[in-house]
Amino acid sequence: IWELKKDVYVVELDWYPDAPGEMVVLTCDTPEEDGITWTLDQSSEVLGSGKTLTIQVKEFGDAGQYTCHKGGEVLSHSLLLLHKKEDGIWSTDILKDQKEPKNKTFLRCEAKNYSGRFTCWWLTTISTDLTFSVKSSRGSSDPQGVTCGAATLSAERVRGDNKEYEYSVECQEDSACPAAEESLPIEVMVDAVHKLKYENYTSSFFIRDIIKPDPPKNLQLKPLKNSRQVEVSWEYPDTWSTPHSYFSLTFCVQVQGKSKREKKDRVFTDKTSATVICRKNASISVRAQDRYYSSSWSEWASVPCS
Amino acid sequence: RAVPGGSSPAWTQCQQLSQKLCTLAWSAHPLVGHMDLREEGDEETTNDVPHIQCGDGCDPQGLRDNSQFCLQRIHQGLIFYEKLLGSDIFTGEPSLLPDSPVGQLHASLLGLSQLLQPEGHHWETQQIPSLSPSQPWQRLLLRFKILRSLQAFVAVAARVFAHGAATLSP
């Protein structure tokens, strides 16, 4: 058993049929010694008396808010949550496996630049009685500070018969050094509580590996005289790290016909313009990627050819 | 050339070669070994590779103030990785395919380090990998980790040279 926060405790249980469970001793936070009784949740049934209560925790029915009273007055509470371990593996019932970039990916994180700011998100089908708490650091043995905000519900989607909820959190490294080569990864830890079930999820990454620039901005076409060719130009996204002579991007320019089956013409360039042939009803799209480190491409920025 | 006296390197040449290094480092990884990389090893497996850290002056401001600190750090790293790529981790079994980009990568590391420090000039003592023989069964994982680490190192070096070529070239 360990303390998650004041008066909230997590009991770690090996979860299998007829498991013996864990013996837990609760102590009433009071100077009183006599006349103390214990109850669980809203029940008035007295579970025991005395300053300590010993219980055998085996299932969710044994978890909940234990309260000690004296003469009708509440003295203190202890909330017991369960953390299940099945076949040596901690349960992951609360969050959905996003399966990207690999199986057992519950947390996904992205950064728009090298400033040390990043966003993580996760998915669940649970709509109520759900709380999240997020902590982060750089490195684990001698951790350096990363400050995370509160997790918020950022999107709701309907997937077949189910509703899916996306939560996200923004974090900022306290003393970020954008130009340095990271040697210690960022660690993100999410505590999830659904009713009386506790689970924790972690992710470890370098900012460089989660970089995904915003799409290029101000995408414009300029027809070239007496030609089917156009000059496409664009700019670095505002959110990208500066100076651009240091934090450079590379770009992919694509000409795509109306039909998805039509052949795509692609050009790669380090410049912020390119000359392409604009076909009727086609569109021109541009996306960006760090020039020197193959992290994710941005989403496409697009304009119609006409 | 970034000779220890403090004169400027051939920024544009360094930029071109460091960008080529980035491309090679990504094409060399993941290496096609004789088997899949099955186990994620612990972090103790690789030597303590040199990293370009916050105080090394490789940020735009630091380069403007005095690029020598940064260039020396990059040079140390290039020599370190060049030695790693020549060690039995890469020359031993499971053998690299004859057309593996590692050979080119190795030569380019040497080429860039020589651009930074021509024959006859010496910066202070290098950080050299302490290389005891690597067991064949460890090598695929070691290669994977070294190349991952090299990708990060050469990305920073390439940014330095790109910025230098754009803003510090005579």
Partner: antibody, heavy 116, light 107 residues
Framework: EVQLQQSGPELVKPGASVKMSCKAS????????MHWVKQKPGQGLEWIGY????????NYNEKFKGKATLTSDKSSSTAYMELSSLTSEDSAVYYC?????????WGQGTTLTVSS | DIVMTQSPATLSVTPGDRVSLSCRAS??????LHWYQQKSHESPRLLIK???QSISGIPSRFSGSGSGSDFTLSINSVEPEDVGVYYC?????????FGSGTKLEIK
């Protein structure tokens, strides 16, 4: 075509030393390890050690430490093995071999006879 | 050291037979196992690498299988020129060790 050409047979007296060579051609000498293997008459194969010609790093079978010394010369793409304090137990055929898993290139062997 | 045990020590076969040579390692060596053929007065020749990978120029009748500590070299239709001693080799860890060999004879 990859070839490993070993030096000719040696007849030496007990207590003496001998240095045999293995000249590599048809590939980049510094790109692979060079192993050395011992085979006593009518017996099996025993690994002595290897040299990495790129950095002259060596790795020996404990059994041959102090007995064998591996060196190489990049300029001539040649690997060498010196055997010291020779006894009749050292009489054998000695092979050089490039990385085991690349085409299995072995030299033709150098026969060493130790006899008074 | 990893001990490589080969069986049988000698195998007498008729041309056209399918034969299996066994090699056992004293501890797991994953698939880091190589097979060699050595004919009289010749250098060893690599037949199979990494337990089952074929080598160019080696006839397709030679195949390998196994992983961990048990390995097999199969010759699916023995030819008279296949006589010689067959060695397996631990390529997993130092010191590299060879089996004592299986001598293949033609009846």
């Amino acid at each position: 075509e990859v070839q490993l050409q070993q030096s000719g047979p040696e007849l030496v007296k007990p207590g003496a030393s001998v240095k045999m060579s293995c000249k590599a051609s048809g590939y980049t000498f510094t790109r692979y390890l060079m192993h050395w293997v011992k085979q006593k008459p009518g017996q099996g194969l025993e690994w002595i050690g290897y040299i990495n010609p790129y950095n002259d790093g060596t790795n020996y079978n404990e059994k041959f430490k102090g007995k064998a010394t591996l060196t190489s010369d990049k300029s001539s793409s040649t690997a060498y093995m010196e055997l010291s304090s020779l006894t009749s137990e050292d009489s054998a055929v000695y092979y050089c071999a490039r990385n085991w898993d690349v085409g299995g290139y072995w030299g033709q062997g150098t026969t060493l006879t130790v006899s008074s | 050291d990893i001990v490589m045990t080969q069986s049988p020590a000698t195998l007498s076969v008729t041309p056209g037979d399918r034969v299996s040579l066994s090699c056992r390692a004293s501890q797991s060596i994953s698939d880091y196992l190589h097979w060699y053929q050595q004919k009289s007065h010749e250098s060893p020749r690599l037949l199979i690498k990494y337990a089952s990978q074929s080598i160019s120029g080696i006839p397709s009748r030679f195949s390998g299988s196994g992983s961990g500590s048990d390995f097999t070299l199969s010759i699916n239709s023995v030819e008279p020129e296949d006589v010689g001693v067959y060695y397996c080799q631990n390529g997993h860890s130092f010191p590299f060790t060879f089996g004592s060999g299986t001598k293949l004879e033609i009846k």
